[in-house]
C-alpha cells in the first residue's frame, strides 16, 4: 500500500507478487463521501503506471486489467480529478514481478584448514527479481544437522561456523541448499563429502633453508604444516626465471632435501599441502622464501687474448685481456684474477692478483719464450688456469687468412668473412676475430674485443660493443700450434657522409711542389670508416672547376704532396673526406702561392 489511502483503496488480484507474464486486475475505489463535491458522476478516477496515465473512469470505482509487466517492481497510483481542481492522490500499490528460483547448481563446500569452518558456495541461477531466502542444510552421521539462512538478495555463500573433525575422517556429511520465494522453491542436488574431501589445508608456514657445511649439494628445506598433511608440492626457481621446478613429496614431515640447486643463485621457494593422495584439494602456495645458495669454486676456463706492442730494440709490451666467466661458471663473486707470467727456458715466473679489471699490461724482454696463465678465484677456490704461449701473432705470412671482408649486417652487427690461408688450411686450429674502435693515434687504451671461431668456419658475426657510425679495425688471426698469421680490414655497422672535412694545418713548399698537412677528423665526426681524402684546389678568383687529387685513406697518414701547381699563382685549397655513404662538407680553405720558377 502506498500513502495513507484515506480517500480510497487500490486492490490487486490475484496478488501483489506475480509470475512474469501473468495478468493482474487493479481496482481503485473511493470511500464514501470522498468524491468530488455534490456530483459523483463528476468523479474522474485516473490510474497511473509510474507517471504515465494508463486508464480513467467516471464514477466511484475503476477496474483495469494489466498485462506485460516487466521483471521488477511497478508502481501504480490512482488519482481523482474534479472540475477546476488539481488531481488528488487516492491510493497506490506496488506489484512485484519475478520468477520462482531455479535449482541452485554446483554446490561445493570447503573448510580452510583443519580448524577452519565449513563454508559452501553455489550458483543461484537467473535472478528471481524477488525477495528470495536461501537455507543451507548440513547433515552428518547419527542424524546431526545444522542449518543456516541467508536473506541477502544475492546470496550464494554461507558459512556454517562449525569445523569437521579429523577424528573420523571417513564420516559422510551432506549439504543441500534450498531457495524459497513467493512463487516457489527449489533445492540443489545434495553434495556429500568427508573431512578429507573438503578440508583445504592452510598453506605451509615458517619456511627455512639450511646448507650443511655451506655446500649447495647439502641443502634441506624445512617448513611447518598442519598435523594431517600427507602430501607436499614444492616449487622453486631462480629469482630471474619464470619457469618453476616442481617436486611432489609424500610424508615429508616438514623437510625435504634438494639436490639440483645451482651455486650462488637466488632462488624463490614455495610449498603447498594436501591431506590425501586423491581426495581434497591443495592448499594455496605458501609465502615465498627467497634465499641465495652458497658459492662453489669456479668451473670452466677464462677466454684469454693478448696484444703485443714493440717498444724498442729490447723491450715489448704485452697486454692481456680476458672475458668474465658466465654466472654459471663463476659460481660465486669473483674476488680476483691470478695472472702468472713465466719465461719458459729460464723458469722465471711472476704472479699477480688483479682485482676489478679484466686486463693487465706489462713490459717484458723481447728475448726468451714467454707464457701466461690466468685463473679466476672466488671465496671457494679458483678456476683451472688458461695457459697461453706468447708468440708473434702475425709472423707466419702463409697462415694469414685471405680475402677478408667486413659488411654491415643489420643494426649494430658486422659480418666478417675470409678465406682460409694458402698454407694447408687443415693446419688451422682456430680463428680469432678481434676488433677495436679505430683511433688514429693507435691508442692502446681502447677496449679490445674478440671471439673465437672453429677452424672450419669462414665467417663470424660480431655484435658485442659495436656502435653505429664508428669505424672498427678488424683483424682475423689464424692460429696453428705456436704460429699465427693475420689479416686486417676496417669495417662499420652503419655509416653516413662525414660531418666535416679535414682541417689543413700547414702547406709547405718543397722543390717546386707543395706538401699539405692536415689534422684528422675527430672520430665522432667521421661517421664510419673513411675510404678516401680529397684535396681540391683552384686559382683564386677563378670560376673554373677545381682540380682534385684523391688519396686512399690510411690511418697514420696526415700529409700529401701535390706537384701540379703553377708558380706565382695564388691557389685556394681545401679537403673533404669520404665514407661509402658519401663526401663530407669542405674543411677549412687555405691560400697558397708557389714561389718557385715556372717550368
Amino acid at each position: 500500500k502506498i500513502d495513507a489511502c484515506k480517500r480510497g483503496d487500490v486492490t490487486v488480484k490475484p496478488s501483489h507478487v506475480i509470475l512474469l507474464g501473468s495478468t493482474v486486475n487493479i481496482t481503485c475505489s473511493l470511500k464514501p463521501r470522498q468524491g468530488c463535491f455534490h456530483y459523483s458522476r463528476r468523479n474522474k478516477l485516473i490510474l497511473y503506471k509510474f507517471d504515465r496515465r494508463i486508464n480513467f473512469h467516471h464514477g466511484h470505482s475503476l477496474n483495469s486489467q494489466v498485462t506485460g509487466l516487466p521483471l521488477g517492481t511497478t508502481l501504480f497510483v490512482c488519482k481523482l480529478a474534479c472540475i477546476n481542481s488539481d488531481e488528488i492522490q487516492i491510493c497506490g500499490a506496488e506489484i512485484f514481478v519475478g520468477v520462482a528460483p531455479e535449482q541452485p547448481q554446483n554446490l561445493s563446500c570447503i573448510q580452510k584448514g583443519e580448524q577452519g569452518t565449513v563454508a559452501c558456495t553455489w550458483e543461484r541461477g537467473r535472478d528471481t527479481h524477488l525477495y528470495t531466502e536461501y537455507t543451507l542444510q548440513l547433515s552428518g552421521p547419527k542424524n546431526l544437522t545444522w542449518q543456516k539462512q541467508c536473506k541477502d538478495i544475492y546470496c550464494d555463500y554461507l558459512d556454517f561456523g562449525i569445523n569437521l573433525t579429523p577424528e573420523s575422517p571417513e564420516s559422510n556429511f551432506t549439504a543441500k541448499v534450498t531457495a524459497v520465494n513467493s512463487l516457489g522453491s527449489s533445492s540443489s542436488l545434495p553434495s556429500t563429502f568427508t573431512f578429507l574431501d573438503i578440508v583445504r589445508p592452510l598453506p605451509p608456514w615458517d619456511i627455512r633453508i639450511k646448507f650443511q657445511k655451506a655446500s649447495v649439494s647439502r641443502c634441506t628445506l624445512y617448513w611447518r604444516d598442519e598435523g594431517l598433511v600427507l602430501l607436499n608440492r614444492l616449487r622453486y626457481r631462480p629469482s630471474n626465471s619464470r619457469l618453476w621446478n616442481m617436486v611432489n613429496v609424500t610424508k615429508a614431515k616438514g623437510r625435504h632435501d634438494l639436490l639440483d640447486l645451482k651455486p650462488f643463485t637466488e632462488y624463490e621457494f614455495q610449498i603447498s599441502s594436501k591431506l590425501h593422495l586423491y581426495k581434497g584439494s591443495w592448499s594455496d602456495w605458501s609465502e615465498s622464501l627467497r634465499a641465495q645458495t652458497p658459492e662453489e669454486e669456479p668451473t670452466g676456463m677464462l677466454d684469454v687474448w693478448y696484444m703485443k706492442r714493440h717498444i724498442d730494440y729490447s723491450r715489448q709490451q704485452i697486454s692481456l685481456f680476458w672475458k668474465n666467466l658466465s654466472v654459471s661458471e663463476a659460481r660465486g663473486k669473483i674476488l680476483h684474477y691470478q695472472v702468472t707470467l713465466q719465461e719458459l727456458t729460464g723458469g722465471k715466473a711472476m704472479t699477480q692478483n688483479i682485482t676489478g679489471h679484466t686486463s693487465w699490461t706489462t713490459v717484458i724482454p723481447r728475448t726468451g719464450n714467454w707464457a701466461v696463465a690466468v685463473s679466476a678465484a672466488n671465496s671457494k677456490g679458483s678456476s683451472l688456469p688458461t695457459r697461453i704461449n706468447i708468440m708473434n701473432l702475425c709472423e707466419a705470412g702463409l697462415l694469414a687468412p685471405r680475402q677478408v671482408s667486413a659488411n654491415s649486417e643489420g643494426m649494430d652487427n658486422i659480418l666478417v668473412t675470409w678465406q682460409p690461408p694458402r698454407k694447408d688450411p687443415s693446419a688451422v686450429q682456430e680463428y680469432v676475430v678481434e676488433w677495436r674502435e679505430l683511433h688514429p693515434g693507435g691508442d692502446t687504451q681502447v677496449p679490445l674485443n674478440w671471439l673465437r671461431s672453429r677452424p672450419y668456419n669462414v665467417s663470424a658475426l660480431i655484435s658485442e660493443n659495436i656502435k653505429s657510425y664508428i669505424c672498427y679495425e678488424i683483424r682475423v688471426y689464424a692460429l696453428s700450434g705456436d704460429q699465427g698469421g693475420c689479416s686486417s680490414i676496417l669495417g662499420n655497422s652503419k655509416h653516413k657522409a662525414p660531418l666535416s672535412g679535414p682541417h689543413i694545418n700547414a702547406i709547405t713548399e718543397e722543390k717546386g711542389s707543395i706538401l699539405i698537412s692536415w689534422n684528422s677528423i675527430p672520430v665522432q665526426e667521421q661517421m664510419g670508416c673513411l675510404l678516401h681524402y680529397r684535396i681540391y684546389w683552384k686559382e683564386r678568383d677563378s670560376n673554373s672547376q677545381p682540380q682534385l687529387c684523391e688519396i686512399p685513406y690510411r690511418v697514420s697518414q696526415n700529409s700529401h704532396p701535390i706537384n701540379s701547381l703553377q708558380p706565382r699563382v695564388t691557389y685556394v685549397l681545401w679537403m673533404t673526406a669520404l665514407t661509402a655513404a658519401g663526401e663530407s662538407s669542405h674543411g677549412n680553405e687555405r691560400e697558397f702561392c708557389l714561389q718557385g720558377k715556372a717550368n
Epitope: 580448524q115 552428518g140 547419527k142 546431526l144 569445523n163 573433525t165 579429523p166 577424528e167 573420523s168 564420516s171
Partner: antibody, heavy 116, light 107 residues
Framework: EVLLVESGGGLVKPGGSLRLSCAAS????????MNWVRQAPGKGLEWVSS????????HYADSVRGRFTISRDNAKNSLYLQMNSLRAEDTAVYYC?????????WGQGTLVTVSS | DIQMTQSPSSVSASVGDRVTITCRAS??????LAWYQQKPGKAPKPLIY???SLQSGVPSRFSGSGSGTDFTLTISSLQPEDFATYYC?????????FGGGTKVEIK
C-alpha cells in the same frame, strides 16, 4: 550387532613385546577409523593410537610414539597394536574403539601387565 | 595438545537429583566433545556426541550443551543406575584427550 573383541594381553617383562588384536563384526570395518584406548588400574582413560579406514592416517600419543605400532587388515576385519620396549607404566586395560564423532563402540578390554 | 579439565572430580547426590558436570577445553574445540559413562570393571559407554546429540539407546534424562571451550553434561533426575564415573573427550584434533573424570556417588 556391532561387536569388538580384544585379545593378546598378558604378563610381560619390562623391555618385552606384545601384540594385541581386535576382531570386529556387525559393521563395515573398512569404512571406519579405529582406535586403542587404555586405562591404568584406578586411573582415567588415555587415548593411545588411531588409524584411518585405509591406513593413510596414523596418530600416536607422545607416551607411546616410537614403541607402539598400530595396523589393520580390512580383509580380516582386524585391528592390531604391536607393543615393543614395554615399561611398567604401560600396565593397563587396553580397549579397542570405533570412531564416529567420538568413540561410539568399545570392546570389553584386555589386560596388559608389565612387571619383572 | 588440548587439555580437558573436568569439574567437580566427584559429586554426592541422591536419586531424583539434578546433576551437572562441566568440562573445559584449553582451546576452542567447536562442538566436538563426547561424554562417556563407566562403571567399575566395564568398558566405557558412549552417552553424547557432538556436544549435545544423544547416542541411540541413551535415556533422555541425559543432555549435553556448550561449544567452543565450555561444555556441560546434565542428568535431570538421577536414577540408581546412573551412579558411575563420567568422562568428557575432545574429538576436535589429535592427540585426542580425555578429562580426568567425575565420580557420581550416592549421598
Amino acid at each position: 550387532e556391532v561387536l569388538l573383541v580384544e585379545s593378546g594381553g598378558g604378563l610381560v617383562k619390562p623391555g618385552g613385546s606384545l601384540r594385541l588384536s581386535c576382531a570386529a563384526s556387525g559393521f563395515t570395518f573398512s569404512s571406519y577409523s579405529m582406535n586403542w584406548v587404555r586405562q591404568a588400574p584406578g586411573k582415567g582413560l588415555e587415548w593411545v593410537s588411531s588409524i584411518s579406514s585405509s591406513s593413510d592416517y596414523i596418530h600416536y600419543a607422545d607416551s607411546v610414539r616410537g614403541r607402539f605400532t598400530i595396523s589393520r587388515d580390512n580383509a580380516k576385519n582386524s585391528l592390531y597394536l604391536q607393543m615393543n620396549s614395554l615399561r611398567a607404566e604401560d600396565t593397563a586395560v587396553y580397549y579397542c574403539a570405533r570412531s564416529e564423532l567420538g568413540f561410539d563402540y568399545w570392546g570389553q578390554g584386555t589386560l596388559v601387565t608389565v612387571s619383572s | 595438545d588440548i587439555q580437558m579439565t573436568q569439574s567437580p572430580s566427584s559429586v554426592s547426590a541422591s536419586v531424583g537429583d539434578r546433576v551437572t558436570i562441566t568440562c573445559r577445553a584449553s582451546q576452542g574445540i567447536s562442538i566436538w566433545l563426547a561424554w562417556y559413562q563407566q562403571k567399575p570393571g566395564k568398558a566405557p559407554k558412549p552417552l553424547i556426541y557432538a556436544a549435545s546429540s544423544l547416542q541411540s539407546g541413551v535415556p533422555s534424562r541425559f543432555s549435553g550443551s556448550g561449544s567452543g571451550t565450555d561444555f556441560t553434561l546434565t542428568i535431570s533426575s538421577l536414577q540408581p543406575e546412573d551412579f558411575a564415573t563420567y568422562y568428557c573427550q575432545q574429538a576436535n584434533s589429535f592427540p585426542l584427550t580425555f578429562g580426568g573424570g567425575t565420580k557420581v556417588e550416592i549421598k
